[in-house]
């Protein structure tokens, strides 16, 4: 099943997020992703946990998953590089870099997103955009078109409360509020964008969605700048 959902959001403006990628397994949407360089997509390591025998591809330039669009193109994956410290049973280091079989053809609907290199927390309350093709309600309806939602960043102390994530949120993670509007599992690997810059990647750990006491968890890309640079080099 696809990992992820946008709850309480709305349909995104078509092709207004040209960095948005759909990581696909055997032709079906699995996870979100974000184009960070001409030939590289950043996603979540857990997305490929169950993909050992399947064909992994990356869809760029899409708004609708099913309808033909001039900008849409499906790329094979030359190399998948999960973060070396990612593990199945933790949310830590949940990053994955996918090298496309060739450089993406760039244009208005396909463009890499600048990512944050300065290792400093986003101020609590900052509104950030998260997008994805995950299910849109608790009944499990899957959208065909890209959805998005604006979420306020939550301070780490609140996110670390026992009734929230009880100390699991390290300095390399950040949280966003989850009161009915939320990202969740299948949006895993998708981008959290603050002020036009990639700040976080949706983690793919299992959690309740849309419950304000269980905020969304995002991997802070700035904390992994050295690793990203070393893989892209």
């Amino acid at each position: 099943p696809p990992r992820g959902r946008i709850l309480g959001g709305r349909e995104a403006e078509a092709h207004a997020r040209p960095y948005m990628a759909s990581v696909q397994l055997n032709g079906a949407h699995l996870c979100g992703g974000v184009l960070v360089a001409e030939q590289w997509v950043l996603s979540a390591a857990h997305c490929l946990e169950d993909a050992a025998d399947g064909k992994v591809q990356v869809l760029l330039g899409a708004h609708s998953l099913s309808q033909p669009e001039p900008s849409k193109r499906l790329y094979d994956v030359l190399r998948a590089v999960p973060h070396p410290d990612s593990q199945p049973d933790t949310i830590d280091h949940d990053l994955l870099l996918l090298q496309l079989s060739e450089k993406a053809t760039l244009g208005p609907a396909v463009r890499p997103l600048p990512w944050q290199r300065v290792d400093r927390d986003v101020a609590p309350g900052t509104l950030c955009d998260v997008a994805g093709w995950g299910i849109v309600n608790h009944a499990g309806r899957r959208p065909d078109s890209l959805q998005h939602v604006l979420l306020p960043v939550l301070d780490r102390a609140t996110c670390n409360r026992r009734t929230h994530h009880d100390g699991a949120i390290t300095e390399r993670l950040m949280c966003a509020e989850s009161n009915r509007r939320d990202s969740c599992k299948g949006d895993s690997g998708g981008p959290l964008v603050c002020g036009g810059v990639l700040e976080g990647v949706v983690t793919s750990g299992s959690r309740v969605c849309g419950n304000r006491k269980k905020p969304g968890i995002y991997t802070r890309v700035a904390s992994y700048a050295a690793w990203i640079d070393s893989v892209l080099a």
């Epitope: 609590p124 780490r156 102390a157 670390n160 409360r161 026992r162 009880d166 100390g167 300095e171």
Partner: antibody, heavy 116, light 112 residues
């Protein structure tokens, strides 16, 4: 290694105030709420309140409203609790404890004795 | 406030015995997020309390597997399969689901 170092014992007169401190080290101070707990001699534990070091926001047990004031100094990674209008009933050991991984980390306690 | 009632208040044991401590809350401590924030702490004389069990049955890191927690709703139990000398002290149950968070009165585990 997470450590919470509390200030030393206090002997204070009835009606006076006292301010005790809890200096945090081994983690980022603003990443966790700090809680305060009272333990009267030979008795159980009572939660006083908590504070978010990011913004100074506090939540207090109704029983300690007007008695305890919680503050933080982010620059020194220190939490403070001021107790005012002290009576013999305030004589106790006071603990700070970090929230996040439940209350896994506690200070060593500060003994406050109220006596004329 | 949620009242946490522990029984017994004193539990004399011999080393190697199994020990069982009960904790009952005055109302359900299932949080609105679905989790139950029932914890157990051990306090030895002159020391700060130490976390043993969180969310009813999860052992905190470094806690020996002779400690186990169980229960649901309002009734909870801490079991020590074979008591060792280092286990002696006062055990407190705690609920973190409702504000104000509250502790039980404590159970003193002591040698017979």
């Amino acid at each position: 290694e997470v450590q919470l170092q509390q200030s030393g014992p206090e002997l204070v007169k009835p009606g006076a105030s006292v301010k005790i401190s809890c200096k945090a080290s081994g983690y980022t101070f603003t990443d966790h709420y700090m809680n305060w707990v009272k333990q009267s001699h030979g008795k159980s534990l009572e939660w006083i309140g908590d504070i978010n070091p990011n913004n100074g926001g506090t939540s207090c047990n109704q029983k300690f409203k007007g008695k305890a004031t919680l503050t933080v100094d982010k620059s020194s990674s220190t939490a403070y609790m001021e107790l005012r209008s002290l009576t013999s009933g305030d004589s106790a050991v006071y603990y700070c404890t970090r929230e996040g991984a439940s209350f896994a980390f506690w200070g060593q306690g500060t003994l406050v004795t109220v006596s004329a | 406030d949620v009242l946490m009632t522990q029984t017994p208040l004193s539990l004399p044991v011999s080393l190697g015995d199994q020990a069982s401590i009960s904790c009952r809350s005055s109302q359900s401590i299932v949080h609105s997020n679905g989790d139950t924030y029932l914890e157990w702490y051990l306090q030895k004389p002159g020391q700060s309390p130490k976390l043993l069990i969180y969310k009813v049955s999860n052992r905190f890191s470094g806690v020996p597997d002779r400690f186990s927690g169980s229960g649901s709703g309002t009734d909870f139990t801490l079991k020590i399969s074979r008591v060792e000398a280092e286990d002696l002290g006062v055990y407190y149950c705690f609920q973190g689901s409702h504000v104000p968070v509250t502790f039980g009165a404590g159970t003193k585990l002591e040698l017979k």
